[in-house]
């Protein structure tokens, strides 16, 4: 039960995390205009990975896409790549983890296969989360560097009365969404990996003794009732032999009125 809960919770947390990574990647507010030196501006600038926007106080917002690929900073390209890799890995991880969920039965899939799939999806979520955190952190570092560079030459035209105030950018909402989402995906991945340990069959084989009653060919199977109910959580790690040496899962794989899908 605890394993199923851990796996399910890991899946849900990762799902929220990946949705957050997608949202952060699409958001325009990766960097927003720093208003410390000019809190009374009637024009507000903010930038995303894909376009930059200007919001006028009058309510009009104008966004322009970065239609060049070669003209963009290498760091921005790297951040884009990291976020996309994170999304792709996360999406694949989600797909794999759906089939790995213990509460979902697909054909005659063994616990060992589900355990492997859970581990695979967990690793994918961890890498996805790390990609998102790395991407956001690289962008944040870029912002901090540019912020202090522009502060060093805040006023580019101090000659006489005329002042040209350079626009400085600070952390936008997307960065925080990205950090949180990356963290959630990472946590979800770790939970999936923990759940995998509980799903993996133990090495020890416990052999059941068959008692053949005269005139009847009925095999006594320890935990057999639980196997038939579809709730065999206590016996899931025991291999029960029944003449043909089938595992409990194989016995269960034939649907009965007691099977819950």
């Amino acid at each position: 039960m605890a394993v199923t809960a851990c796996q399910g919770l890991g899946f849900v947390v990762s799902l929220i995390g990946i949705a957050g990574i997608i949202a952060a990647t699409c958001m325009d507010q990766w960097s927003t205009q720093d208003l410390y030196n000019n809190p009374v501006t009637a024009v507000f600038n903010y930038q995303g990975l894909w376009r930059s926007c200007v919001r006028e106080s009058s309510g009009f917002t104008e966004c322009r896409g970065y239609f060049t690929l070669l003209g963009l900073p290498a760091m921005l390209q790297a951040v884009r790549a990291l976020m996309i890799v994170g999304i792709v890995l996360g999406a694949i991880g989600l797909l794999v983890s759906i089939f790995a969920l213990k509460c979902i039965r697909i054909g005659s899939m063994e616990d060992s296969a589900k355990a492997n799939m859970t581990l695979t999806s967990g690793i994918m979520f961890i890498v996805s989360g790390l990609c998102a955190i790395a991407g956001v952190s690289v962008f944040a570092n870029m912002l901090v560097t540019n912020f202090w560079m522009s502060t060093a030459n805040m006023y580019t035209g101090m000659g006489g009365m005329v002042q040209t105030v350079q626009t400085r950018y600070t952390f936008g909402a997307a960065l925080f969404v990205g950090w949180v989402a990356g963290g959630l995906t990472l946590i979800g991945g770790v939970m999936m990996c923990i759940a995998c340990r509980g799903l993996a069959p133990e090495e020890t084989n416990y052999k059941a003794v068959s008692y053949h009653a005269s005139g009847h060919s009925v095999a006594y199977k320890p935990g057999g009732f639980k196997a038939s109910t579809g709730f065999g959580s206590n016996t899931k790690n025991k291999k029960i032999y029944d003449g043909g040496a089938r595992t409990e899962d194989e016995v269960q794989s034939y649907p009965s009125k007691h099977d819950y899908v």
Epitope: Q33, A42, V43, V54, E56, S58, G59, F60, T164, T167
Partner: antibody, heavy 117, light 113 residues
Framework: QVQLQESGPGLVKPSETLSLTCTVS????????VSWVRQPPGKGLEWIGV???????NYHSTLISRVTISKDTSKSQFSLKLSSVTAADTAVYYC???????????WGQGTLVTVSS | DIVMTQSPDSLAVSLGERATINCKSS????????????LTWYQQKPGQPPKLLIY???TRESGVPDRFSGSGSGTDFTLTISSLQAEDVAVYYC?????????FGGGTKLEIK
């Protein structure tokens, strides 16, 4: 089409509060801002302040302690209150809608307010 | 506050001639985000409210004749009337729309010579 019309008393006594109303039609009060601008007789334009679509306000630094701009969306009205008026506040008061580039694209006809005892 | 300085205070130009009005701001009105200058030009005829002519320093408002054009960037701006018509007699104002307070220039009175 967009229309703005200022209304209020034409005469205000010194030290009293000047109250004007701008009734608008043809645009959404929650989407666009409205500025108040005044023009003393024979002089240039002076921006007083603005209330934006989201309800936030900005005022001229020289008037900030005396001015309040508000709006009543249900009545499609904007109001200007200027306290402790003096003869220097005698002017034609205009309300104007803010558009692209924060420019004032539609103006009311204006109302003359005289401050005199 | 940004100070807007217009020159000349008054200007007399013959009909059909070019009229040029200058406006200088104490700070740059160029927004780096969209590379647009937040400067607006208005025309005010006697007894009337001002009328928007040009915003973003060079974008003509719809319905404004194409003889009116705006130019300039940063702190120096110009309104040009390529061929003066009798109906262009008015006072012209520039306005900073970049930073609060949204200050106006002192105005330039345009007359016919």
């Amino acid at each position: 089409q967009v229309q703005l019309q200022e209304s209020g008393p034409g005469l205000v006594k010194p030290s009293e509060t000047l109250s004007l109303t701008c009734t608008v039609s043809g645009f959404s009060l929650t989407s666009y801002g409205v500025s108040w601008v005044r023009q003393p007789p024979g002089k240039g334009l002076e921006w007083i302040g603005v209330i934006w679509g989201d309800g936030s306000t900005n005022y001229h630094s020289t008037l900030i302690s005396r001015v309040t701009i508000s709006k009543d969306t249900s009545k499609s009205q904007f109001s200007l209150k200027l306290s402790s008026v003096t003869a220097a506040d005698t002017a034609v008061y205009y309300c104007a809608k803010a558009g692209r580039g924060n420019a004032l694209d539609y103006w009311g006809q204006g109302t003359l307010v005289t401050v005199s005892s | 506050d940004i100070v807007m300085t217009q020159s000349p205070d008054s200007l007399a130009v013959s009909l059909g001639e070019r009229a040029t009005i200058n406006c200088k701001s104490s700070q740059s009105l160029l927004n780096s985000g969209n590379q647009k200058n937040y400067l607006t030009w208005y025309q005010q005829k006697p007894g009337q409210p001002p009328k928007l002519l040009i915003y973003w320093a060079s974008t003509r408002e719809s319905g404004v004749p194409d003889r009116f054009s705006g130019s300039g960037s940063g702190t120096d701006f110009t309104l040009t009337i390529s061929s003066l018509q009798a109906e262009d007699v008015a006072v012209y104002y520039c306005q900073n729309d970049y930073s609060f307070p949204l200050t106006f220039g002192g105005g330039t009175k345009l007359e016919i010579k």
